[in-house]
């Protein structure tokens, strides 16, 4: 094939891949006709003038995870049809100087994974084509301004893992053609206002593992076509009131792991694409009226591990869509009977992990679609008569870890227990915690005859309207134990960032054990 | 007769971690919750977690990047690991359950306590 | 979390007299379905465990003297013990379980 070099591998598709440690420099001759090149994984250390002068058809040269910390500013001479180029997952600390020049028909360039310590505007001055240009993983502590104003034709520009501490609001001015932004896991504080005005076709903006503490309220109003935004993992700990209001098109946010305190009504939206919302581990204390009435389309609600201790009642107001709301791990100790009425299509809700003592009998009225409820270890003692008669698709249900009062007002949710057994899952049952001679015993099995008359707790409202025992049970004959699937944090959908996060059972949305983290 | 025994303590290096194990007889951890407490000499008492008899968890939220409480019911033995130890996580540790007690986070029986000293 | 501050810091009491400690907490520890404050009281003798003493304020927990009692309601309690014995010398904690619990600073009380 027109002379491959014995250390390479040559295709008849014009294909060349050299790798292996005893390569220590380019490769020659290499086959005129190439059109494909990549050295991978070799000891080479440096590129010097012109190695591939002899192969100009070139289109796509992959240098990738070698030992390259030097290049001769003429390296890549008479490479004019050459669209891509990578030089990622290599050891350069500097870029010489016009080493892209006479570089006219470059797409994509690849220069994530190094050391380098700084660009300067004239690196890219001669990559008027330009599409796609992956920085991350480098040493970078600043942008200068002007370093990607020659770059109008961009379209996706990843500057995350890099060192960048602030970002000047000029720097992407020019970039009116890009739809991905990525300034993840850098060391910003703040984002000076007008920073993104210029990025009127931006689709996603990843802003997460940073250490933005505040938002300015106009941050955003310039990129309506915005559909994916992450912002979890930093310091912001308010939202201001318009912040969010100019995004139509956003059907991605994430907020978690901030220090958001509240949220007021209002704030997300409108949104008429948002499935799911993302605001577990932050200090919320309480979920006012309509705070979410704007997200008419949103699935997925995931509000654990804040520190909600209320929530009013019309807090869900507009959630009409929502199938899956996460509560666990906060505070409540009460909730409104009418809180989740407006959730005709929840299947799944999770309430583990707070202090609930009791719950109104009709806190599931309207939400007959019900699949699985977390109620483990809260503070339950019992529950209210027929609260979960009407949920005949309810196949999982977590009771355990509660202080269950096995005197005679247990007993009807006891018998119905009986007869939902599979429901409860084989793993962990509910036991009494009182009276002390029955504590630890399986409320299930517990021996009626032990049970003692009801003390001094004030009575549970109930509803004997309700019927304990339906003359024929609604309920389906099922061992099944969940019909979720486990999230523990939304994946960033996109292959060159890894920040997916691991839990322990402590995780954020909770559904079972055996699927959590 | 009801019983719960701490070991594991001893000497630990800043930045180290600990595994304290809290032997149980007399009950079963699938029917009780055991409590881990703490308290630095001539100090007070400082709550750190619980696991419930169904293997749930809640932590002292200012340590609880630090904390795992885990347990194995067959060997009736319940386990604090902590990590990132610094001087002012010397103290001895407790565990407790709560036996007769109608108060749910009631510790109406405690271990005698195993000391941990934290010092380079 | 809630706080809870007891006062005073010790107390010297004859033998035979009443002894008062105060616990309050940073917000009420009330229930008002249940009707429970979730407030404990444990007692600490030099070189023992704690030993429980009274929950929910005001119940005492099965073979505790009746010279202890428990008062209080919402963010306000208090422990008597209304005729010192030379065995009460010890150091008493008040504990919410409102929400996690937490303990208060710890009162010790000596024979004067």
């Known amino acids: 094939y027109h002379g491959c070099p014995s250390e390479c591998t040559c295709s008849r598709a014009s294909q060349v891949e050299c790798t292996g440690a005893r390569i220590v420099a380019v490769p020659t001759p290499l086959p005129w006709n190439a059109m494909s090149l990549q050295i991978l994984n070799t000891h080479i250390t440096e590129l010097n003038e012109s190695p591939f002068l002899n192969i100009s058809a070139l289109i796509a040269l992959r240098i990738e995870k070698n030992e390259l910390s030097r290049i001769t500013p003429g390296a890549f001479r008479n490479l004019g049809s050459l669209r891509y180029l990578s030089l990622a997952n290599n050891k350069l600390q500097v870029l010489p100087i016009g080493l892209f020049q006479g570089l006219d028909s470059l797409e994509s360039l690849l220069l994530s994974s190094n050391q380098l310590l700084q660009i300067q505007p004239a690196h890219f001055s001669q990559c008027s084509n330009l599409k796609e240009l992956q920085l991350h993983g480098n040493h970078l502590e600043y942008i200068p301004d002007g370093a990607f104003d020659h770059l109008v034709g961009l379209t996706k520009l990843n500057l995350g893992k890099n060192s960048l501490t602030h970002i000047s609001p000029r720097v992407f001015q020019h970039l009116g053609n890009l739809q991905v932004l990525r300034l993840y896991e850098n060391r910003l504080t703040d984002i000076p206002m007008g920073t993104f005005d210029g990025l009127v076709n931006l689709q996603e903006l990843a802003l997460q593992q940073n250490q933005i503490g505040l938002l300015s309220p106009g941050l955003f109003h310039n990129n309506h076509n915005l559909q994916r935004l992450y912002l979890s993992n930093n310091h912001i700990s308010q939202l201001p009131p318009s912040v969010f209001m100019q995004l139509p098109q956003l059907n991605r946010l994430t907020l978690f792991g901030n220090s958001l305190k509240e949220l007021s009504p209002g704030i997300f939206g409108p949104m008429p694409n948002l499935r799911e919302l993302w605001l577990y581990d932050n200090h919320i204390s309480s979920l006012p009226d309509n705070v979410f009435s704007n997200l008419r389309q949103l699935q997925v609600l995931i509000l654990s591990r804040n520190q909600i201790s209320f929530i009013s009642p019309g807090a869900f107001n507009g959630l009409t869509e929502l199938r899956e709301l996460s509560l666990h791990t906060n505070a409540l100790q009460d909730l409104d009977g009418n809180v989740f009425r407006m959730l005709a299509n929840l299947q799944n809700i999770s309430l583990q992990n707070n202090r609930l003592r009791q719950l109104p009998g009709n806190i599931f009225a309207n939400v007959n679609g019900l699949m699985a409820i977390q109620l483990q270890n809260n503070q339950l003692e019992n529950l209210p008569l027929g609260i979960f008669d009407h949920l005949g698709k309810l196949c999982e249900l977590r009771l355990y870890d509660n202080p269950w009062r096995c005197d005679s007002d247990i007993l009807p949710l006891r018998n119905w227990l009986l007869l939902n057994q599979p429901r409860l899952g084989t793993d962990t049952v509910p036991v009494c915690f009182s009276p002390a001679n029955v504590r630890g015993q399986s409320l299930i099995i517990i021996n009626v005859n032990v049970a003692v008359p009801s003390v001094h707790v004030p009575e549970v409202p109930s509803y004997p309207e309700t019927p304990w025992y339906p003359d024929t049970p609604s309920y389906p004959d099922t061992t099944s134990v969940s019909s979720t699937t486990e999230l523990t944090s939304p994946v960033e959908d996109y292959t060159d960032l890894t920040t997916i996060q691991v839990t322990d059972d402590r995780s954020v949305w909770g559904m079972t054990q055996a699927q959590s983290g | 007769e009801v019983q719960l025994v701490e070991s594991g303590g001893g000497l630990v290096q800043p930045g180290g971690s600990l595994r304290l194990s809290c032997a149980v007889s007399?009950?079963?951890?699938?029917?009780?919750?055991v409590h881990w407490v703490r308290q630095a000499t001539g100090k007070g008492l400082e709550w750190l977690g619980v696991?419930?008899?169904?293997?749930?968890?809640n932590y002292n939220s200012a340590l609880m990047s630090r904390l795992t409480i885990s347990k194995e019911n067959a060997k009736s033995s319940v386990y604090l690991q902590m990590n990132s130890l610094r001087a002012g996580d010397t103290a001895m540790y407790y565990c407790?359950?709560?036996?007769?007690?109608?108060?749910?986070?009631?510790?109406?029986?405690w271990g005698q306590g195993t000391t941990v000293t934290v010092s380079s | 979390d809630i706080v809870m501050t007891q006062s005073p810091d010790s107390l010297a009491v004859s033998l035979g007299e009443r002894a008062t400690i105060n616990c309050k907490s940073s917000?009420?520890?009330?229930?008002?379905?249940?009707?429970?404050?979730?407030l404990a009281w444990y007692q600490q003798k030099p070189g023992q465990s704690p030993k429980l003493l009274i929950y929910?304020?005001?119940t005492r927990e099965s073979g505790v003297p009746d010279r202890f009692s428990g008062s209080g309601s919402g963010t306000d309690f208090t422990l008597t013990i209304s005729s010192l014995q030379a065995e009460d010398v010890a150091v008493y904690y008040c504990?919410?379980?409102?929400?996690?619990?937490?303990f208060g600073g710890g009162t010790k009380v000596e024979i004067k």
């Open positions: 929910w304020a005001s």
């Open positions: 917000q009420s520890l009330l229930n008002s379905r249940t009707r429970h404050n979730y």
């Open positions: 407790a359950t709560h036996m007769i007690t109608e108060d749910y986070y009631g510790m109406d029986y």
């Open positions: 696991i419930w008899a169904g293997g749930s968890t």
């Open positions: 504990k919410q379980s409102y929400n996690l619990p937490t």
């Open positions: 007399g009950f079963s951890l699938t029917s009780y919750g």
